[in-house]
Amino acid sequence: QHHGVTKCNITCSKMTSKIPVALLIHYQQNQASCGKRAIILETRQHRLFCADPKEQWVKDAMQHLDRQAAALTRNGGTFEKQIGEVKPRTTPAAGGMDESVVLEPEATGESSSLEPTPSSQEAQRALGTSPELPTGVTGSSGTRLPPTPKAQDGGPVGTELFRVPPVSTAATWQSSAPHQPGPSLWAEAKTSEAPSTQDPSTQASTASSPAPEENAPSEGQRVWGQGQSPRPENSLEREEMGPVPAHTDAFQDWGPGSMAHVSVVPVSSEGTPSREPVASGSWTPKAEEPIHATMDPQRLGVLITPVPDAQAATRRQ
């Protein structure tokens, strides 16, 4: 079921602030039909952010991801882009999608499908409010706002489009970077039923350096926030599951965020992942100026995780 590439599936109203390329695993350009050109960045936690293609850091990040993808390919990596419908991974999200919401955009275009491979944690992380704020505490202050769980790789607060939870079905994207080990949303599409991202050994929570996937770009994890906060252990648990705008700038200096505005269908969650609140800080996820994303339900179900209250989120304690 290929749809034409004419329709705009993601519209960015706001652009994210800088995100370390180490935290990014893929990027894609939105369609020309969207009018405002933007680069959609996916973090290792599978959070999506809109970025301005004219900014130098975005250009550098894309270049870096392109190099990584090329290196992966040279090394016999398995990064492939897949077009078409991708079945959801069989691996259930470890923690349930909790707050995730299923997004059903109208897929347009030939994006390659992404498969989120989330681990529940990932999902949780993703759930974390925008990336945790900087948990930069050097341990000195015994409290660290838990940066958003790793799942929330940092991202500027308020700019996140939406998180693609690991457990959702694939989304259609074209990725230009290698798939990063661990929960990943982009499909490593090799088969319609993509294997879980982790290698069996990894699943056991152990990984050995030689694996090729290790080369995937890594993404930083803390919230890019400026304040530090404790990392709460079970910090936040959200109950509501409605269509919630995805995070907004979770990263530290991220500018107003871009969120995905979509009609969402709550997904029943197995449990609410305990999330680490976002770090302290003055930022609060903004729910305004959502991004419009439309996707074809048939093509994919993207899980979106709502962004918790900035205050609700507090770091690890």
């Epitope: 935290l23 550098d60 990932e122 949780q124 930069g136 050994s201 996937e213």
Partner: antibody, heavy 119, light 107 residues
Framework: QVQLVQSGAEVKKPGASVKVSCKAS????????IHWVKQAPGQGLEWIGW????????KFNERFKGRTTLTADKSTNTAYMLLSSLRSDDTAVYFC????????????WGQGTTVTVSS | DIQMTQSPSSLSASVGDRVTITCRAS??????LAWYQQKPGKAPKLLIY???TLADGVPSRFSGSGSGTDYTLTISSLQPEDFATYFC?????????FGGGTKVEIK
């Protein structure tokens, strides 16, 4: 309060292996990456790699690939670094550290584990 | 890989002095720079991240600045407890790399 407590000093012979542990407490272990950093005697700091305890996925500095294995045990909130085929230049203090999700800078560190490789 | 070059490698100063340490990256690290302080036999302690954001509990006499490839750590008025070794670290891209360190000694 966040704490990373590492295992004690080790003395090994060349060719042997050593497994250093890092027990985390005070936060949700599976939500934050654990990084490993090497500091040879009188030298600077060198990033070895990270592991995400949530799913066990690792990432390595190419310089340390091949002889280094990073694992995590969610049941005990402990991360491990296994160094195999030890050489004299592996003699160093190894630190585990963790940071926020917005970037991989390290706000909490273990106390360090000294590994001495000597015949 | 991005190389981080720190200078000076050591310096002698007195209490009350203003001290400046620089770190130069081999490529643009977009302000994703952290500074650490390490004392003998101890683990490093985070002072600053994102080029200028002070970590929790760090005295305001420490400040960071810079952009692109050049960054600076400044201690406005050196205190007795500041005599230590300082390292910069870039976290823009992996592998994360550290500067060689600057040892601040008592004059």
């Amino acid at each position: 309060q966040v704490q990373l407590v590492q295992s004690g000093a080790e003395v090994k012979k060349p060719g042997a292996s050593v497994k250093v542990s890092c027990k985390a407490s005070g936060y949700t272990f599976t939500n934050y990456y654990i990084h490993w950093v090497k500091q040879a005697p009188g030298q600077g700091l060198e990033w070895i790699g990270w592991i995400y305890p949530g799913d066990g996925s690792p990432k390595f500095n190419e310089r340390f690939k091949g002889r280094t294995t990073l694992t995590a045990d969610k049941s005990t909130n402990t991360a491990y670094m296994l160094l195999s085929s030890l050489r004299s230049d592996d003699t160093a203090v190894y630190f585990c550290a963790t940071g926020p999700t917005d970037g991989d800078y390290f706000d909490y560190w273990g106390q360090g584990t000294t590994v001495t490789v000597s015949s | 890989d991005i190389q981080m070059t720190q200078s000076p490698s050591s310096l002698s100063a007195s209490v009350g002095d203003r001290v400046t340490i620089t770190c130069r990256a081999s490529g643009n690290i977009h302000n994703f720079l952290a500074w650490y302080q390490q004392k003998p036999g101890k683990a490093p302690k985070l002072l600053i991240y994102n080029e200028k954001t002070l970590a929790d509990g760090v005295p305001s006499r420490f400040s960071g600045s810079g952009s692109g490839t050049d960054y600076t750590l400044t201690i406005s008025s050196l205190q007795p407890e500041d005599f230590a070794t300082y390292f910069c670290q870039q976290f823009w891209s992996t592998p994360y790399t550290f500067g060689g360190g600057t040892k601040v000694e008592i004059k």
